[in-house]
């Protein structure tokens, strides 16, 4: 490598001097000079800065508003923002998780393929042949039709994607 033709990686140029940036968790109070150092101060209780910076103000931690169905998943530090997630039964409306909506239920004829999390909605799938769901649920998968044969019974009414088969006794031939 050749000698520098710009300030180094963790530096910035001000008044012809390459000054050290403030490290994550600290804000800039004063720039360096030939004789003095960059002066940095730690962010306050509910503040953070997550990069090497020359910011004169720290960012406020995100507020997880319970009125929007939010709760704290991970408390913020001086170097990281607070991470919000949704209350049980709700999920985030965006990646930033600024508000929550109720988990979707899967209608009859559909089962849960993937249960919702704090950040993703319920994923439903249509019940294939041989399976049914007769409820609206955010948890229930499609159930297999009852096997009449294993119970020594016969199918009296065929199943659908919303109903189970109906089994009945076999007709016995009388002599």
């Amino acid at each position: 490598p050749e000698p520098p033709t710009a300030c180094r990686e963790k530096q910035y140029l001000i008044n012809s001097q390459c000054c050290s940036l403030c490290q994550p968790g600290q804000k800039l109070v004063s720039d360096c000079t030939e004789f003095t150092e960059t002066e940095c101060l730690p962010c306050g209780e509910s503040e953070f800065l997550d990069t090497w910076n020359r910011e004169t103000h720290c960012h406020q931690h995100k507020y997880c508003d319970p009125n929007l169905g939010l709760r704290v998943q991970q408390k913020g530090t001086s170097e990281t923002d607070t991470i919000c997630t949704c209350e049980e039964g709700w999920h985030c409306t965006s990646e930033a998780c600024e508000s929550c909506v109720l988990h979707r239920s899967c209608s009859p004829g559909f089962g849960v393929k993937q249960i919702a999390t704090g950040v993703s909605d319920t994923i439903c799938e249509p019940c294939p042949v041989g399976f049914f769901s007769n409820v609206s649920s955010a948890f229930e998968k499609c159930h297999p039709w009852t096997s009449c044969e294993t119970k020594d019974l016969v199918v009296q009414q065929a199943g659908t994607n919303k109903t189970d088969v109906v089994c009945g006794p076999q007709d016995r031939l009388r002599a």
């Epitope: 033709t5 180094r8 990686e9 963790k10 390459c18 940036l21 490290q23």
Partner: antibody, heavy 126, light 107 residues
Framework: QVQLVQSGAEVKKSGASVKVSCKAS????????IHWVRQAPGQGLEWMGW????????NYAQKFQGRVTMTRDTSISTAYMELSRLRSDDTAVYYC???????????????????WGQGTLVTVSS | DIQMTQSPSSLSASVGDRVTITCRAS??????LGWYQQKPGKAPKRLIY???SLQSGVPSRFSGSGSGTEFTLTISSLQPEDFATYYC?????????FGGGTKVEIK
């Protein structure tokens, strides 16, 4: 205030290795490169190389390539210079110095050193 | 490597004298050069960068000039505290190289 404090004098046998430390205080250690310069008794100054304390990247003078290793421990704001296969002509005072850059127009960046460590005398006896 | 040839290697002068030290680079280095002062048992101290800008806090009797391959450090009126060894340092290309030094002694 800003200072670099080096480890004490060392006496080593020919063929051995020496590791000199340089503890920084009063500034953000990761923000400035550390250079190493040596001075044999009654002789001039000789640049050995630098280390970027943030990434650990190094740049050594060709003369010392293969014999010098510069490392750092950011948790204790300390840079190290290890010189192996010592010879009697390695007897010198070893200085660490913080690099400062001043923009002097266009792509000109003046490289200067401030502060310097107090120096560590390494004596190599045969 | 860029060779820095400094002259004279030593000189004797009296307080009040004008002193000139020269540094010659083996190839052009623009004005990528600094001057350092070193007193016995101490680390060097920067005086001038790049080539002609005086470090803040350094007395104005020190001045630097030159560009390309020829550089000069001048002390207009030598003071008792100026007796020391002076080095030039080129930072145009790696490896950084120092001149051999000029020892300024009391006559």
């Amino acid at each position: 205030q800003v200072q670099l404090v080096q480890s004490g004098a060392e006496v080593k046998k020919s063929g051995a290795s020496v590791k000199v430390s340089c503890k920084a205080s009063g500034y953000t250690f990761a923000g400035y490169y550390i250079h190493w310069v040596r001075q044999a008794p009654g002789q001039g100054l000789e640049w050995m190389g630098w280390i970027n304390p943030d990434s650990g990247d190094t740049n050594y003078a060709q003369k010392f390539q293969g014999r010098v290793t510069m490392t750092r421990d950011t948790s204790i704001s300390t840079a190290y210079m290890e010189l192996s296969r010592l010879r009697s002509d390695d007897t010198a005072v070893y200085y660490c110095a913080r690099e400062r850059l001043t923009h002097c127009g266009g792509d000109c960046y003046s490289q200067w050193f401030d502060p310097w460590g107090q120096g560590t005398l390494v004596t190599v006896s045969s | 490597d860029i060779q820095m040839t400094q002259s004279p290697s030593s000189l004797s002068a009296s307080v009040g004298d004008r002193v000139t030290i020269t540094c010659r680079a083996s190839q052009g280095i623009r004005n990528d050069l600094g001057w350092y002062q070193q007193k016995p048992g101490k680390a060097p101290k920067r005086l001038i960068y790049p080539a002609s800008s005086l470090q803040s806090g350094v007395p104005s009797r020190f001045s630097g000039s030159g560009s390309g391959t020829e550089f000069t450090l001048t002390i207009s009126s030598l003071q008792p505290e100026d007796f020391a060894t002076y080095y030039c340092l080129q930072h145009n290309s790696y490896p950084l190289t120092f001149g051999g030094g000029t020892k300024v002694e009391i006559k």
